[in-house]
């Protein structure tokens, strides 16, 4: 049975999803898809990886970790009831049938009335919106948002930040984790 | 328009090897999934392989795993099944097709007789 | 693996008449991950159908795929004459792919 995973309507969901590289900058092919895993890749696929970079992503999703170190957790802006469902995150380990695939059932729930504070920092204030282009020299990474001087390495440690808070912890205890290697 | 064009067929001797070769043009071949499909005379389809994107994942169906590779060359627009190790049950129509699950476009087929 | 079950084996109707196929699974196919082909006498399959109920391109608004679960159906609302055929269902929410045997549509 899917693992599950809770957002509010106007948030930003969050699905984690790890593996750990073979290699520094080894990286494997990883693909997001709403609706459970198929048999091949991933069905309506809404971002998609390669040895190298995101190379296909759509409007309100993207990977705020480093994915370039196993990082493959999924976000999702400004949720509505509609994203509801399972999602699938496929690893595509290289070799004769090895993927691994974890299907992941989001609940989104009505908006509170009253907002509570939250206990952790906006996961949009937290990391500007990461758009990652293909080109035939190395990978250049824009930010787009508010905080536009905010470098790979800040980025890093906001990423560090939000996998040591108790919140992201306890996703990834209970979120798809291999070990490739 | 999309073409795939399979070639390398023939009669073999059982124990016998064959290299089917699929040729594509009319789209971007790197960016797609590719298939092998079979049909025996007068029976109906049977999936055989998959290779991804850059042929770095392979996928094989239990009653040719071992025997049958997969491969691609996305330089020269090409899939490959090197068959080994052929038996009669594996005669059949060899087509190759294009798509990740579901597959939109099929070739012609080429014909695989395995006789003594 | 999943089987895939279609009935009948063979179909003999008039062109113009209501065509029913269905594709049975021998348990559930998640997502509704089927799709239908069609395949004429020494020629390759052509795509009708994949996710159960959508289109592929160019292909005429009188097919039509229905179905969740493990109960599947292709209905041709309309026969015309390039219509008579086999047809196979395709399932693909578990591995390995498997296809149904086919329902040949004969003029009858």
């Known amino acids: 049975s899917e693992v599950e995973y809770r957002a509010e309507v106007g948030q930003n969901a969050y699905l984690p999803c790890f593996y750990t590289p073979a290699a520094p900058g080894n990286l494997v092919p990883v693909c997001w898809g709403k609706g459970a895993c198929p048999v091949f890749e991933c069905g309506n696929v809404v971002l998609r990886t390669d040895e190298r970079d995101v190379n296909y992503w759509t409007s309100r999703y993207w990977l705020n970790g480093d994915f370039r170190k196993g990082d493959v957790s999924l976000t999702i802006e400004n949720v509505t009831l509609a994203d509801s469902g399972i999602y699938c995150c496929r690893i595509q380990i290289p070799g004769i049938m090895n993927d691994e695939k974890f299907n992941l059932k989001l609940v989104i729930k009505p908006a509170k009335v009253t907002p509570a504070p939250t206990r952790q920092r906006d996961f949009t204030a937290a990391f500007p919106r990461m758009l990652t282009t293909r080109g035939h020299g190395p990978a250049e990474t824009q930010t787009l948002g508010s905080l536009p001087d905010i470098n790979l390495t800040q980025i890093s440690t906001l990423a560090n930040e939000l996998r040591d808070s108790r919140l992201a912890n306890d996703l990834r205890d209970s979120g798809a984790t291999i070990r490739i290697g | 328009e999309v073409q795939l064009l399979e070639s390398g067929g023939g009669l073999v001797q059982p124990g016998g090897s064959l290299r089917l070769s699929c040729a594509a043009s009319g789209f971007t071949f790197s960016g797609y999934w590719m298939h092998w499909v079979r049909q025996a005379p007068g029976k109906g389809l049977e999936w055989v392989s998959a290779?991804?994107?850059?042929?770095?994942?392979?996928y094989y169906a239990d009653s040719v795993k071992g025997r049958f590779t997969i491969s691609r060359d996305n330089s020269k627009n090409t899939l490959y099944l090197q068959m080994n190790s052929l038996r009669a049950e594996d005669t059949a129509v060899y087509y190759c097709?294009?798509?990740?699950?579901?597959?939109?476009?099929w070739g012609q087929g080429t014909l695989v007789t395995v006789s003594s | 693996e999943i089987v895939l079950t279609q009935s009948p084996g063979t179909l003999s109707l008039s062109p113009g008449e209501r065509a029913t196929l269905s594709c049975r699974a021998s348990q559930s196919v998640s997502s509704s991950y089927l799709a239908w082909y069609q395949q004429k006498p020494g020629q390759a399959p052509r795509l009708l159908i994949y996710g159960a109920s959508s289109r592929a391109t160019g292909i005429p608004d009188r097919f039509s795929g229905s179905g969740s679960g493990t109960d599947f159906t292709l209905t041709i609302s309309r026969l015309e004459p390039e219509d008579f055929a086999v047809y196979y269902c395709?399932?693909?929410?578990?591995?390995?792919?498997?296809f149904g045997q086919g329902t040949k549509v004969e003029i009858k």
């Open positions: 290779i991804s994107y850059s042929g770095s994942s392979t």
């Open positions: 097709a294009k798509g990740t699950n579901w597959l939109d476009y």
């Open positions: 395709q399932q693909y929410g578990s591995s390995p792919l498997t």
